[in-house]
């Protein structure tokens, strides 16, 4: 009996036309939502003038439906048993699942000012930028609508820069009508234990953002894993959002709509400093902000963002060192709300429920030659927003899953 089930599973999780896995893989049957909470700055003047702690108040959720588009350019390669594809991006605002509209205003860090002062360290260039910042009446903080902040706006300061720079700024700009990839993953035909594991991303086996093993593209994209998942396994996956591979470990057994699943979580160790977790040494890319690689819980992904000083963390700086959150008032991290988990059906390796949580932060540093940053006495890793991307298997799919997979085994 067990062998027959194993055989059936192995057949059905292969990523090729005609299998259950392939149908759900090309276009997810699960509704995926991305909720945003924006950190509204309450005291912009005090911060700019006196280098006070930044007081933030989160506002949200603002919800978008995402991942509703089918994979594109799906191409099988029989020779190396891989399938390549593009994952198109799309986001549709869901007013009924949101606290307000896309036109809601927020006081946030001026993304262009913070980035330009970081990218151009030369004092003379900073003075030129300062004159343009003043001319455009820009400041350290700005008021932007949700739509502008997420999807892009024409920045008045950058519009004056004589250099050919992109004048449109947004945390997720460009997003709609773009695609992530090309991904090339193993289809599992020759070896089911490799199914969905990424072979190459954008034509490469490495990212070119990190040194050593940190630069590797490991595991799957977390939508599924090779079948017959064990609790003892460390599940590796790659997330283009955070420009790195990461891992999850088993936490508990969960019953999801009558289906037994394993809850895997991202452990705090994955965010630890190299002092505590030596494997993380290659995620420490500079010595000053990281306080000689002793800070933890924030990841400098500037190399992946054209030099813009973007730092990724967990929401509310969960699992981050006290020095990171010390200059920010109004944060309340808690594991239940702010950690990332994957609920995996162990026989098939399918992720039936997940909550991916991350926070986007921007570094802003004092600058002697940029007036609006001149009074700062310290560096700030400023939280801009945090997001919760969730998906849960639908009732109909769950019934089908119970009858065809778990029911047969039990």
């Amino acid at each position: 009996g067990d062998l027959l089930i194993q055989k059936t599973i192995k057949k059905q999780v292969v990523l090729e036309e005609g299998t259950i896995a392939f149908k759900n893989w090309v276009k997810t049957g699960t509704e995926v939502y991305r909720q945003f909470w924006i950190f509204d700055v309450q005291n912009p003047q005090e911060v700019m003038m006196n280098s006070s702690n930044i007081q933030v108040k989160q506002r949200g959720p603002y919800t978008y439906r995402v991942r509703f588009l089918a994979k594109e350019n799906v191409t099988q390669d029989a020779e190396d048993n891989t399938v390549s594809f593009l994952q198109p991006n799309g986001a549709i605002f869901e007013p009924s699942l949101s606290v307000g509209t896309e036109a809601d205003n927020f006081t946030v860090l001026n993304l262009a000012v913070a980035a330009a002062s970081h990218i151009y360290q030369n004092q003379f260039v900073q003075m030129i930028l300062n004159s343009l910042i003043n001319k455009s009446k820009s400041s350290m903080f700005q008021v932007r609508t949700l739509r502008e902040l997420l999807w892009g706006y024409r920045d008045p300061f950058l519009s004056l820069v004589p250099y050919p720079v992109t004048t449109t700024v947004g945390l997720f700009y460009p997003y709609n009508n773009t695609a992530d990839g090309v991904y090339k993953v193993f289809n599992g035909k020759d070896n089911i234990s490799k199914v969905a594991i990424i072979d190459t991303y954008k034509g490469k086996r490495n990212l070119s953002y990190w040194e050593s093993h940190c630069d590797m593209i490991n595991g799957t994209d977390a939508a599924s894993f090779p079948p017959f998942v064990e609790k003892s396994q460390v599940l590796q996956f790659f997330s283009s959002d955070i420009c790195r591979s990461i891992y999850a470990v088993f936490e508990s057994d969960v019953n999801l709509k009558g289906i037994p699943v394993y809850r895997f979580v991202l452990p705090s160790k994955a965010f630890a400093s190299p002092v505590e977790n030596p494997d993380n040494y290659c995620f420490c890319t500079e010595k000053i902000i990281s306080k000689n690689c002793t800070s933890y819980g924030v990841l400098d992904i500037s190399k992946c963002k054209e030099g813009r000083p973007v730092y990724i963390s967990l929401p509310h700086f969960l699992y981050a060192s006290p020095d990171v959150s010390e200059p920010i008032d109004g944060l309340n991290p808690n594991e239940e709300e702010h950690r990332t988990y994957l609920d995996i059906e162990p026989i098939t390796g399918f992720t039936l429920q997940f909550a991916k949580r991350l926070q986007v932060n921007l570094l802003v540093k004092p600058s002697e030659k940029i007036q609006v940053l001149k009074n700062l006495k310290r560096n700030y890793i400023v939280p801009i927003l945090w997001l919760n991307e969730t998906g849960t298997i639908g009732d109909e799919k769950a019934n089908m899953f119970r009858s065809q997979v778990t029911g047969k085994i039990n």
Epitope: N122, Q123, F124, V125, M127, S131, E368
Partner: antibody, heavy 123, light 107 residues
Amino acid sequence: EVQLVESGGGLVQPGESLKLSCESNEYEFPSHDMSWVRKTPEKRLELVAAINSDGGYTYYPDTMERRFIISRDNTKKTLYLQMSSLRSEDTALYYCARHGYDYDEEGAWFAYWGQGTLVTVSA
Amino acid sequence: ETTVTQSPASLSMAIGEKVTIRCITSTDIDDDMNWYQQKPGEPPKLLISEGNTLRPGVPSRFSSTGYGTDFVFSIENMLSEDVADYYCLQSDNLPFTFGSGTKLEIK
């Protein structure tokens, strides 16, 4: 020792154009921000234009009204100032100046100067 | 634009005397003031840069103080070779602006 040699000055009529050059003997020329500064007959020093090391960023005071264009050719280790629609008030000794000392890049503005080239605008 | 007011316009001092020149700026420029010496027929020479920093090779009789909007340049014991025009320059913001100059002569 850093040497900056200006050339191209002379007597021109109002409305005419002139191109000044400043040649450097320095291997490190492409690493330095540069400026043109002029000294008027009234002995006033004025910034005319400035350019960053790779030529990507230029700066002109509003008073210069964009009649002047600063540029550089790092392969030739030369700085230029294209002057057009010249007026009598542009009469001055034009200096090119290099920012920064070798060991101390920041905060040493106009650290080295050329001898200057005289521009006279007169009918 | 930050305007720089330099005084006096000219100064006649005896050898060995202390010389002081003052520059006042229209905006707060922290300590971003520089001082230049220009002798006849020569280009200006940077003596003191931002932060009241004496440049290498410049004699220690030259000094400056000041922060914000008020700056003073001093020559402790004037020598005959110090006869020149002296200019201050604010480098806090663009456009860099010079003082109108002080002509130092021997009494």
